[in-house]
Each structure stands twice: as C-alpha cells, then as structure tokens.
C-alpha cells in the first residue's frame, strides 16, 4: 500500500505564439481545480476508461479575475497535494491524465459551471520511494508544470511497496539475513511470507503463502511473462489471463539485471531499469560518481561526491533514465491531432498537419466551430471536419443541451443512495455496506468483506467516482 | 435558472393538515438527488423534518415526524409536497424545500413559506 | 436521536476578530465529513458556507473555514466583518439517510 503524490507548480499559457485568452474575466471570475486519474501499465486507454489505479480531485484554487487587456499569466493554483492512495504494489509502470476545470463563479442560481480548460496524459516509469520526477506537458496553448511520486505506506517498503518492514526485536541489530529498512533504520525488513519461489521481482504477497503477480507476469510464481502477441503457441491462450502465455523460459526470467535493476522484455533481447548508483546493461557498474560521468546524452550530474552518496542525472528533452540512457519516443504518445503526421526532431517535435487543420499539433480545425455555440458552458472542440462539444460536467448531448444523469445506470449497490454531485458520481451506502459503489457488506463485528480496507476506509464511508 | 419556491396556506386551523408544493425550475426530478423540507419557529434553530430521494422515490423523517409527516413528488408537473397532519400552534413556523445532491447538505433552498397554525 | 451541539450559542465580536465556533455530534457523521455549514440572516434562507467539513462554497469569502472529522466540527472566520452578523448553523448527514442541524450560534458585531 503506498501514496501517489502529485504537486502542481504552474499552470498558463505555453512558450511560442499564440498565447492563450485568459478563462476568467471581469464579468465572470473562476478558478481552478484539477483531477487526476491513474491506470496501472503503459496502457493507452480512453479517457473514460476506469481508473483502476486511483483518482483524485484538488480543491479549489483562489478567485482570479482577468486584468482587462493583460496576457494570461500562470493562474493561481489550489493549496496542497493531490494524493491518490493505491492498496496493491506500486505497478512501476503506469498511466496519467490530468485535467485543468475551470469553475465560473458568474451570478448564475444554483451554482458555477464547469468547464474542462486542458487535459494532459503520459505514460511513466516510476519506482515507489524515489524522489520527486518533475514534468512539464502542454495541451494546446496551455503549459502545466508539475512534479510526482509514489511513496509506501508503513510497513510497506521497497520500489513496488512490497516489502514490510517490522520494528527490531532486539535493539542492536535485524535478526539473520534481515536488512534494515532503510530509511526507518530502527526497523528490520520482515522475513519473506510469500509462497516459496515466488518471483521477487514480478510477485508480491499480502498473505503467508500466496503469490501474485505484478501486471505483465503470470504462472504459480509469476515468472511467465504474459505475451499482448497473437497466440501462437499450441497450448493457446492461457485462461488465466485475456494475453498468452509464452512457453519456454522468457529473456527476463531468472532476472538478468543485478543490483536491484528490473528487467523488461524488449521485442529482441531485454532492457535493464538500474537503481541510482549503477549502470550498464545488466545494471553491473557501480560505485559510480559524477567525477565518473554517468549522464549520458549531455545529462547534467548532480550530487555523488563520494562512491557512498547517489547522484541524479537531470536529462535533456528527448531522454530520460536514471542515465539518461533512454531516448523518449515522444511521437508514441501521438502529440498530433487530427491525422498530423509526428516527426522528432531531437531538439524538438514538429506535427505536419492534414489539409484543413493547422496548430503546433493539428489542433486547429480552421472553421469547425465557425459561428457554432455550445449550450451550459460547453467548449467547442474542432477536428474532423465537424465541429463537436466539449460539455461541462453534467450535460451531454451533440450541443451540450442534454442534462447527463451519472445515475441513470443504478451504480450504487445494495439500495445505496446515489447522486449526481458536480464532482462526480457519490453513493451514500445503506447502514450495512461500504465501499465505492456500496458492494462490501460490513460484517456485525464491525469488520469488512473487503480483503483489506485502504487506509482510512471504515464502514460507510463514501466514495466519490471522478 | 435552477431555483425552488414554496407555495401553501398562511394560516391553518388546529387539527387540519398542512400540505405544502415545492415548485422548481431548471432541472428535474428524473437526476438523482435528495429533496427535503426543513422548518424554523419564530426565533428558533432550523428543523429538518424529512427527505424524498428521487432515485427511487423512497422518504425518510425525522423521528419526530414520522406518522405526521408525508412527503411526496410528481416529476411530470416539476413539484413536491408535504403533508403535515395533527396540526398544533407549536408547528407555526417558516417551512422550507431544499435540494442536496451529494454529500450531504442542502446547496440549494427555496426562499420559505410562513404558515400560522391558530384557532 | 442523534444531537448537534453548537457552541457557543451567543458571541458577540469585533470587526477583524478572529471568531470560531463548535460543533459536536452524538454519533459520526456518514464517512466522517459529511458535515456542513450555513449562515443565516434574518427574513432569508440558509446561505450554504462549507461542505464536507472544509470545502469553501462558491462565491464564499476565503476568511471562512472549516475543520474537524467523525464528531467534532469548526468553522472559524478569520477576520471578522460587519456583514458577517448572523446566525450560524451546523448540519450533518448519518447513516441511515438521516439528517440533523444544530442549535444555531448568533454573532453579534460589536
């Protein structure tokens, strides 16, 4: 069990022309607020698909109003972190998209309207317990700067939270074979529980005994990679899994990668993510410094005067890794709309667009929404060739004049109350139930059906579906 | 523009029932959230007397309330009611529908009605 | 029946005092912040302030906040303003479906 942590440091206009008209005026302050949805994996899912990871909503930010004439500045951003709590491992690979509301505070009875300002998405590497990752992404004219992390819930410790650490039975020292828990350096990691063989790297347990198996591995001790290749194989798809099985002993079984690298398969061969303080193809070299240069690619060296302390590669656009040894393909997250064809650059990513469309990144259908209007506060989006709206939360509908009811579907289960609240869908449980979507019976003795409350779970405690 | 106006009876005799209508405009009864009826005696705290859930449909009241109190909905004329038996001075007081749609509390309230409850 | 306490039931206040009131519940509110706040001025409706505990409405000054988990509630106004005179009310929300408000504090200015 751990935390993603997300801090939002700026959000306005991006570098280069265009710069965009500011979402608030004199006659119709706002402000803004964010949501952030998880997916485990480098999936490319919808935007409407679950988030099977975790989401989260910021509060409020302050009240802004536009000084008439002046450009959009940064606009000023809600207190705090957005933290999404995760129960399982840490996935190290994972999905985000992040979305910029704005909410107007005009005059209007019955509160503000929302309106979607920008959403950005990636797909990142990221252990548990490492230090802030910073990032910038833009979404049409608009720039948002911030920074993420996953860190582990006590007990739970190590690059996936998988790991428990216990305090010291004995004050000097752990018990044999037992390391420290760095950085709770009072506690002892606790003896493995898993099932015996339980890969160490692709399996984790929250029981004595069992075994399960990160995301992309499958068998009794996860060491058999799934495989997103047709099924070729004669024992055909496994029912295990929706992938395949791959038979015979896979590039990363058995771990190739020394000094707690973790290995991913490549279509030839396999790939190594070293922990700071190695390098190399199997994660082999170490001790390294920055009088060593470790940062490759014209990555700036930072900290690791001596062999014991670790150093940080800060990388240029166009790489990342601790080394900056991986070159990002940047054209994979498909920056160009509407059909633009992706060329990178090195320096930099350049979108040549289909004919009608224009932009840094095609998003400009030239007359789409020409004289069109979108009802309730409903941006209108071009694109295609038709033009098409962007709905504030609660309206639907071609024009935004149909009022969407999140409830018509009866999420909220066991006679839940469920209702439809600018923040999303919320289910108040019957006395009985608890959970999301009110599914998890609460047993008399007060405990759960779920196989672990996330932290700060208790009986009838709603959630809130973004 | 969303808003609720109460409309009833200024003045009812002891032992009558009191109905009330809660008409509202600018959205509808067929989204899923909670209707209720809150009161305040002259000078006094408010009182929540009870709820009808749109979802379903379904009514809860204040303890005190039950057996006294019925609330209803019609979503084809946009109205709810509240029907308020055995009537005594005690229930003089401005009556109030408000409107919650999640998590709890009443964002939105009509603007009161005064009934007088006197012989 | 579950009860809110509200206290203190009177307070009377300078202009740019910092002002903070009290709520308390006989049982948990529904998942522990399902508690609001409202401000009421004479001949007028309940003015929504805070929701779940510490959620400032839209439209409402940044001088009102709310605080508190389960049973035990505050909304505090930090610097306090003439028009800020009123009434104040606690409600929360139970399980059961079951709502209560509590007594009411008036703020006197003075």
């Known amino acids: 069990a751990g935390v993603f942590e997300l801090q939002i440091h700026s959000f306005g206009p991006g570098p280069g022309p265009g710069a965009p008209r500011s979402p608030c005026s004199a006659r119709l302050p706002c402000r803004l607020f964010f949501r952030v949805c998880l997916k485990p994996g480098l999936s490319e899912e919808a935007a409407e698909s679950p988030c099977a990871l975790g989401a989260a909503l910021s509060a409020r930010g302050p009240v802004y109003t536009e000084q008439p004439g002046a450009p959009a500045p940064d606009l000023p951003l809600p207190d705090g972190l957005l933290q999404v709590p995760f129960r399982d491992a840490w996935p190290g690979t994972f999905s985000f998209i992040i979305e910029t509301w704005r909410e107007e505070l005009g005059d209007q009875i019955g509160g503000p309207a929302w309106s979607l300002l920008a959403r950005v998405a990636g797909r990142r590497r990221l252990a548990a317990g490492g230090p802030w990752a910073r990032d910038i992404q833009r979404a049409g004219a608009w720039e948002l700067r911030f920074s993420y992390r996953a860190r582990c819930e006590p007990p739970a410790v190590g690059t996936a939270c998988t790991r428990l650490c216990r305090p010291r039975s004995a004050p000097s020292r752990c018990g044999p074979g037992l390391r420290p828990c760095a950085p709770l350096e009072d506690e002892c990691e606790a003896p493995l529980v898993c099932r015996a063989g339980c890969s160490p790297e692709h399996g984790f347990c929250e029981q004595p005994g069992e075994c399960r198996c990160l995301e992309g591995w499958t068998g009794p001790l996860c060491t058999v990679p799934v495989s997103t290749s047709s099924c070729l194989s004669p024992r055909g798809p496994s029912s295990a899994t929706t992938g395949c099985l791959v038979p015979g002993p896979g590039p990363c079984d058995g771990n190739p990668c020394a000094n707690g690298g973790s290995c991913s398969e490549t279509p030839r061969s396999f790939e190594c993510t070293c922990p700071r303080g190695f390098y190399g193809l199997r994660c082999e070299v170490s001790g390294v410094t920055c009088a060593d240069g470790p940062c490759f690619n014209g990555g700036l060296c930072v900290g690791g005067a001596d062999p014991d302390s670790a150093y940080i590669c800060h990388c240029p656009p166009g790489f990342q890794g601790s080394n900056c040894e991986k070159r990002v393909d940047r054209c994979s997250l498909q920056p160009c709309r509407n059909g633009g064809l992706c060329l990178d650059l090195g320096h930099a990513l350049r979108c040549r667009c289909r004919a009608g469309f224009a932009g840094p990144r095609c998003e400009h259908d030239l007359d789409d929404c020409a004289g069109r209007a979108c009802a309730n506060g409903g941006t209108c989006v071009e694109g295609g060739g038709a033009h098409r709206c962007s709905c504030a939360l609660g309206f639907g509908g071609r024009d935004c004049r149909e009022r969407a009811d999140p409830c018509a579907a009866r999420p909220c289960a066991h006679g839940g109350r469920c209702y439809a609240h600018f923040s999303g869908l919320v289910c108040a449980c019957a006395p009985g139930y608890m959970g999301a979507r009110c599914e998890f019976p609460v047993h008399p003795d007060g405990a759960s059906a779920l196989p672990a409350a996330p932290p700060g779970l208790r009986p009838g405690d709603p959630q809130r579906y973004l | 523009q969303v808003q609720l106006k109460e409309s009833g009876p200024a003045l009812v005799k002891p032992t009558q029932t009191l109905t009330l209508t809660c008409t509202f405009s600018?959205?509808?009864?067929?989204?899923?959230?909670?209707m209720g009826w809150v009161r305040q005696a002259p000078g006094q705290g408010l009182e929540w007397m009870g709820t009808?859930?749109?979802?379903?449909?379904?009514?809860d009241y204040a303890s005190w309330a039950k057996g006294r109190v019925t609330i209803t909905a019609d979503e084809s004329t946009s109205t709810a009611y509240m029907e308020l038996s055995s009537l005594r001075s005690e229930d003089t007081a401005v009556y109030y529908c408000?409107?919650?749609?999640?998590?709890?509390?009443?964002?939105?309230w009509g603007q009161g009605t005064l009934v007088t409850v006197s012989s | 029946d579950i009860q809110l306490t509200q206290s203190p039931s009177f307070l009377s206040a300078s202009v740019g005092d910092r002002v903070t009131i009290t709520c308390q519940s006989t049982?948990?509110?529904?998942?522990?912040?399902?508690l609001s706040w409202y401000q009421q001025k004479p001949g007028q409706p309940p003015k929504l302030l805070i929701y779940?505990?510490?959620n400032l409405e839209i439209g409402v000054p940044s001088r009102f906040s709310g605080s508190g988990s389960g049973t035990d509630f505050t909304l505090t106004i930090n610097s306090l303003e003439a028009e800020d005179a009123a009434t104040y009310y606690c409600?929360?929300?139970?399980?059961?479906?079951?709502?209560?408000f509590g007594g009411g504090t008036k703020v006197e200015i003075k």
């Open positions: 408000a409107r919650n749609t999640g998590y709890g509390y009443f964002g939105l």
């Open positions: 600018g959205f509808s009864l067929s989204s899923s959230y909670d």
């Open positions: 009808i859930y749109t979802g379903d449909y379904s009514t």
């Open positions: 049982e948990s509110v529904y998942g522990s912040d399902w």
């Open positions: 779940q505990a510490s």
């Open positions: 409600q929360g929300y139970y399980s059961g479906y079951i709502y209560a």
